[in-house]
């Protein structure tokens, strides 16, 4: 019969014959022969391969370096890499999460729209009219101005995006 020029899924072509790829979590030791199947070996303790493959090396699991603010979110297996995330108060600098930076704080005049996670930074938004933030915070939203009317008080000083209104008593000297 004619030697194959292409192989089925989960196979590879070598020496004019189709050999089975090694399953995820295993690496190639020896190609198949016309008499025997592909010889594969499991990846070692801190290694993985996540696809059907003909790799002769397994990949090393990612190291979550605590000196870079990283910690293990999900331990790697022979078929999956370790997933790192950042310590509390920090977030990843990239999708690969190779290092961490402190969560950004929202300055006075800005409130937190979305609290940071291990993989995303704080999202701030300017306080709209009627709201303020007088602190630099990674958690505080814009607060609404105090309603002087509901307290039977009047506005003595208008609020800004950084300060609350100042309420005072009603003027009783009116005719």
């Amino acid at each position: 019969p004619e030697p194959p020029t292409a192989c089925r899924e989960k196979q590879y072509l070598i020496n004019s014959q189709c050999c089975s790829l090694c399953q995820p979590g295993q690496k190639l030791v020896s190609d198949c022969t016309e008499f025997t199947e592909t010889e594969c070996l499991p990846c070692g303790e801190s290694e993985f391969l996540d696809t059907w493959n003909r790799e002769t090396h397994c990949h090393q699991h990612k190291y979550c370096d605590p000196n870079l603010g990283l910690r293990v979110q999900q331990k790697g297996t022979s078929e999956t890499d370790t997933i790192c995330t950042c310590e509390e108060g920090w977030h990843c600098t990239s999708e690969a999460c190779e290092s961490c930076v402190l969560h950004r704080s929202c300055s006075p005049g800005f409130g937190v729209k979305q609290i940071a996670t291990g993989v995303s930074d704080t999202i701030c938004e300017p306080c709209p009219v009627g709201f303020f933030s007088n602190v630099s915070s990674a958690f505080e939203k814009c607060h609404p101005w105090t309603s002087c009317e509901t307290k039977d008080l009047v506005v003595q000083q208008a609020g800004t995006n950084k300060t609350d209104v100042v309420c005072g008593p009603q003027d009783r000297l009116r005719a």
Epitope: L28, V29, S30, D31, E37, E39, T56
Partner: antibody, heavy 115, light 109 residues
């Protein structure tokens, strides 16, 4: 056609050294492990060591420090360097393809350690 | 190193007999075990790998079984060409080393 051909055997004095070669053809060393196995006259098979396609090597405990497996990919050839040879190293030395699926073997080369 | 203990060391049998050889590993090796046949002056020939898989071309009268530490090679009906020495070989799953059993010589009764 897959072939393994050992060479380099012969008579060597105790304490001497010898380098055996294993010429591989019909397949690539870049994706295949090669094991060395020996057999003393009238005795059983004894595993010596292995070199993986990755270049990693492992040895039987008695061979560590005295025997070294290496390869030259450009020549598709394996080597077994044997140092500090003793009378009990007298054996036919085989190279074979694989780890625990040794289908292809060389014809063997005889090493005699004697004064 | 892993140790492979093979028994018996020799067996006398007649053509047509059923012959069983056992092999015990010093620690669990899953199914990373092979059986070889060797005739005088020749290189060994692979009979079984992965404990129970026959290479194509090996007669079906040869069979292997077992996993972990205990393995068996069976020749269901001994043929004249089967008189030889048989070896088991077990390997660490890590790939860090293998060992052969001491061998079983199958002789004509």
């Amino acid at each position: 056609e897959v072939q393994l051909v050992e060479s380099g055997g012969g008579l060597v004095q105790p304490g001497g050294s010898l380098r055996l070669s294993c010429a591989a053809s019909g397949f690539s060393l870049s994706s295949n492990a090669i094991s060395w196995v020996r057999q003393a006259p009238g005795k059983g098979l004894e595993w010596v060591g292995i070199i993986y396609a990755s270049g990693d090597t492992y040895y039987a405990s008695w061979a560590k420090g005295r025997f070294t497996i290496s390869r030259d990919n450009s020549k598709n050839t394996l080597y077994l360097q044997m140092n500090s040879l003793r009378a009990e190293d007298t054996a036919v030395y085989y190279c074979a393809r694989g780890y625990t699926t040794l289908y292809f073997w060389g014809q063997g080369t005889l090493v005699t350690v004697s004064s | 190193d892993i140790q492979m203990t093979q028994s018996p060391s020799s067996v006398s049998a007649s053509v047509g007999d059923r012959v069983t050889i056992t092999c015990q590993a010093s620690e669990s090796i899953s199914t990373r075990l092979a059986w070889y046949q060797q005739k005088p002056g020749k290189a060994p020939k692979l009979l079984i790998y992965s404990a129970s898989t026959l290479p194509s071309g090996v007669p079906s009268r040869f069979s292997g079984s077992g996993s972990g530490t205990d393995f068996t090679l069976t020749i269901s009906s001994l043929q004249p060409e089967d008189f030889a020495t048989y070896y088991c070989q077990g390997g660490y799953s890590s790939g860090a080393g293998t060992a052969f059993g001491g061998g079983t010589k199958v002789e004509i009764k």
